[in-house]
Interface confidence: low
């Protein structure tokens, strides 16, 4: 229904705190360089204005769209051109072009320092002093670094943060209470960020239809007892929610997500038997819980998929009459039978089925042509299964750090032109798939591995788009989203690459490395490893292992030495010489 004042409607629906949080996220995601105080001031102004509209919907400007109101606020910021360059040109446009322009200027890799967590005592002091401001800072810092973070989920993570601080700041040993809990939230939030970015990429590059197909597959796996009409309704609603969030319409997105959660909880009987626990929770927890609810038990009496989609004499007629609906039912039926497949794989199978019908239904004897389609799925299914087995075996053998290094070597050989920081970040993230997925039961590994890898590779593609340097990467990133992971997996050593010359300073280290946290030390070593591969792309695993073992030994020795500086300055050059010899 149409509301006289959109801003009043959203303020009323969401309540003051969520309204303010979402407006803060929106501004932080659009203008990523502004300080918290600058954004907090804008948020307060918008909130005050919303309240005047709640009091009187006919008040001046209350009938304006949210894009107009927010855009006008952003465009009124002093020194916009000095701080944001050509983003300021967006302000010369009218809506809806102005908002589109803002969206195009979102930076997936802003040059902001890493978000450093203050030490426990300081954190608790500022949290206790003003919890609202503390949480505001959290929302701002995460949102500006992750401009596509799913806004209602970010409110959920802020709430988790709040609850952890509430609990741990009351403990004697705050540090040991906070660290593991906040690390856990950070890890989950980072995964949530790359997953959501993938959804927005799908929406931006391939439109709503592609996203809806993703949603149908995912929902069918989770709710195999829901009928096709129910799944279609949920997929349509979920597509709308994600479209809004990806498009910067965060108030509408959060409001519609709450509506969807409400609908699901009111219709559990026709959706799933597993929703009750989620539905008992308050809003943010409820929506989060529903988004990762366990799969319902599959119906025992499902007929073979071939009956309706291969053996039926009317396959081509049904396909011709309503292509999207027929393909949708195929995706639904196949997905509900295969919770053990990744969504990417299910979409590849649906694409293969569609291509087969396109070809065969134009032939004289279609059934003879499409009769073998299910058998043709086999290689498509085997490829990711082998990927999972090979990689999980390697992870179990090497552990997370060693597995990351193996991936780093592999990907540096595939795309040596890519910047070392990007390769290291990608390999570290890809390597986490082991810890995340390889410990799961067999039937959950494939969906976990492949859908996570796809999300990480999407980030690689986004970073590469900014500065394209590798034809290999461009080729894999230009295709459809579901083909990306197989494309990257199939890449081999880039034969066109001219090896980097050996620079001693790249492999020269100082005693400051000794005091770095373990994670930073690992990154330093992995940076050196990528540089080694760029110098010798065809070095054997054995050669690289020799060099890295030598390097680790050197660090260990010098960091334990009484005079660290002298050790580094005398032993360092020897290490460099040995490295060159080992790789010669």
């Amino acid at each position: 229904e149409a509301h006289k004042s959109e801003i009043a409607h959203r303020y009323n629906d969401l309540g003051e705190q969520h309204f303010k949080g979402l407006v803060l996220i929106a501004f932080s995601q659009y203008l990523q360089k502004c300080s918290y105080d600058e954004h907090a001031k804008l948020v307060q102004e918008v909130t005050d204005f919303a309240k005047t509209c709640v009091a009187d919907e006919s008040a001046a400007n209350c009938d304006k769209s949210l894009h107009t109101l927010f855009g006008d606020k952003l465009c009124a910021i002093p020194n916009l051109r000095e701080n944001y360059g050509e983003l300021a040109d967006c302000c010369t446009k009218q809506e809806p072009e102005r908002n589109e322009c803002f969206l195009q200027h979102k930076d997936d890799n802003p040059s902001l320092p890493p978000f450093e967590r203050p030490e426990a005592e300081a954190m608790c002091t500022s949290f206790k002093e003003n919890p609202t401001t503390f949480m505001g800072h959290y929302l701002h810092e995460v949102a500006r670094r992750h401009p596509y973070f799913y806004a209602p989920e970010l409110l959920y993570y802020a709430e988790q943060y709040n609850e952890i601080l509430t609990q741990c700041c009351a403990e004697a040993d705050k540090e040991s209470c906070l660290t593991p809990k906040l690390d856990g939230v950070k890890e989950k939030a980072l995964v949530s960020s790359v997953r959501q970015r993938m959804k927005c990429s799908s929406m931006q590059k391939f439109g709503e239809r592609a996203f809806k197909a993703w949603a149908v597959a995912r929902l069918s796996q989770t709710f195999p007892n829901a009928d096709f009409a129910e799944i279609t309704k949920l997929a349509t609603d979920l597509t709308k929610v994600n479209k809004e969030c990806c498009h910067g319409d965060l108030l509408e997105c959060a409001d519609d997500r709450a509506e969807l959660a409400k609908y699901m909880c009111e219709n559990q009987a026709t959706i799933s038997s597993k929703l009750q626990t989620c539905c008992d929770k308050p809003l943010l927890k409820k929506a989060h819980c529903l988004s990762e609810v366990e799969h319902d038990t599959m119906p025992a009496d499902l007929p073979a998929i071939a009956a309706d989609f291969v053996e039926d004499q009317e396959v081509c007629k049904n396909y011709a009459e309503a292509k999207d609906v027929f393909l949708g039912t195929f995706l639904y039926e196949y997905s509900r039978r295969h919770p053990d497949y990744s969504v990417s794989l299910l979409l590849r199978l649906a694409k293969k089925y569609e291509a087969t019908l396109e070809k065969c239904c134009a032939e004289a004897n279609p059934p003879a042509c499409y009769g073998t389609v299910l058998a043709e799925f086999q290689p498509l299914v085997e490829e990711p299964k082998n990927l999972v087995k090979t990689n999980c075996d390697l992870y179990e053998k090497l552990g997370e750090y060693g597995f990351q290094n193996a991936i780093l070597v592999r990907y540096t050989q595939k795309a040596p032109q890519v910047s070392t920081p990007t390769l290291v970040e990608a390999a570290r993230n890809l390597g986490r798939v082991g810890t995340k997925c390889c410990t799961l039961p067999e039937d959950q590994r494939l969906p976990c591995v492949e859908d996570y890898l796809s999300a990480i590779l999407n980030r690689v593609c986004l970073l590469h788009e900014k500065t394209p340097v590798s034809e290999h990467v461009t080729k894999c990133c230009s295709g459809s989203l579901v083909e990306r992971r197989p494309c990257f997996s199939a890449l081999t050593v880039d034969e066109t690459y001219v090896p980097k010359e050996f620079k001693a300073e790249t492999f020269t280290f100082h005693s400051d490395i000794c005091t770095l946290p373990e994670k930073e030390k690992q990154i330093k070593k992995q940076t050196a490893l990528a540089e080694l591969v760029k110098h010798k792309p065809k070095a054997t695993a054995e050669q690289l292992k020799t060099v890295m073992d030598d390097f680790a030994q050197f660090l260990d020795t010098c960091c334990k030495a009484a005079d660290k500086d002298t050790c580094f300055s005398t032993e360092g050059p020897n290490l460099v010489t040995r490295c060159k010899d080992a790789l010669a």
Epitope: F127, K128, N130, E159, N162, E163, Q167
Partner: nanobody, 115 residues
Framework: EVQLVESGGGLVQPGNSLRLSCAAS????????MSWVRQAPGKGPEWVSS????????LYADSVKGRFTISRDNAKTTLYLQMNSLRPEDTAVYYC????????SSQGTLVTVSS
């Protein structure tokens, strides 16, 4: 274990007053800011008011400013909300929360304002 127990709700006529209490236990009460949040039937949670750990700083939603007063007694580990000039639109379940959270972790107390 953190526990928050609200009391003091009830049915009142418009213009009258009520005083809500929230007894807290299981954490260092004086170290935490506290809030009152309310949820009207069929609506989302709405923040009402907050108070700092020391009790020096208070904040109010515009809808209650000048009518409601938040306070605390750290010795008794209790939070209060004095509600004057009550209106029908104040009808809701009121619950207290730690920090600025809107998450409900207690039963709450129902306030009904009706003639």
């Amino acid at each position: 274990e953190v526990q928050l127990v609200e009391s003091g709700g009830g049915l009142v006529q418009p213009g009258n007053s009520l005083r809500l209490s929230c007894a807290a236990s299981g954490f260092t009460f004086s170290s935490f800011g506290m809030s009152w949040v309310r949820q009207a039937p069929g609506k989302g949670p709405e923040w009402v008011s907050s108070i700092s750990g020391s009790g020096h700083d208070t904040l109010y939603a515009d809808s209650v400013k000048g009518r409601f007063t938040i306070s605390r007694d750290n010795a008794k580990t209790t939070l209060y909300l004095q509600m004057n000039s009550l209106r029908p639109e104040d009808t809701a379940v009121y619950y207290c929360t730690i920090g600025g959270s809107l998450t409900r972790s207690s039963q709450g107390t129902l306030v009904t304002v009706s003639s």
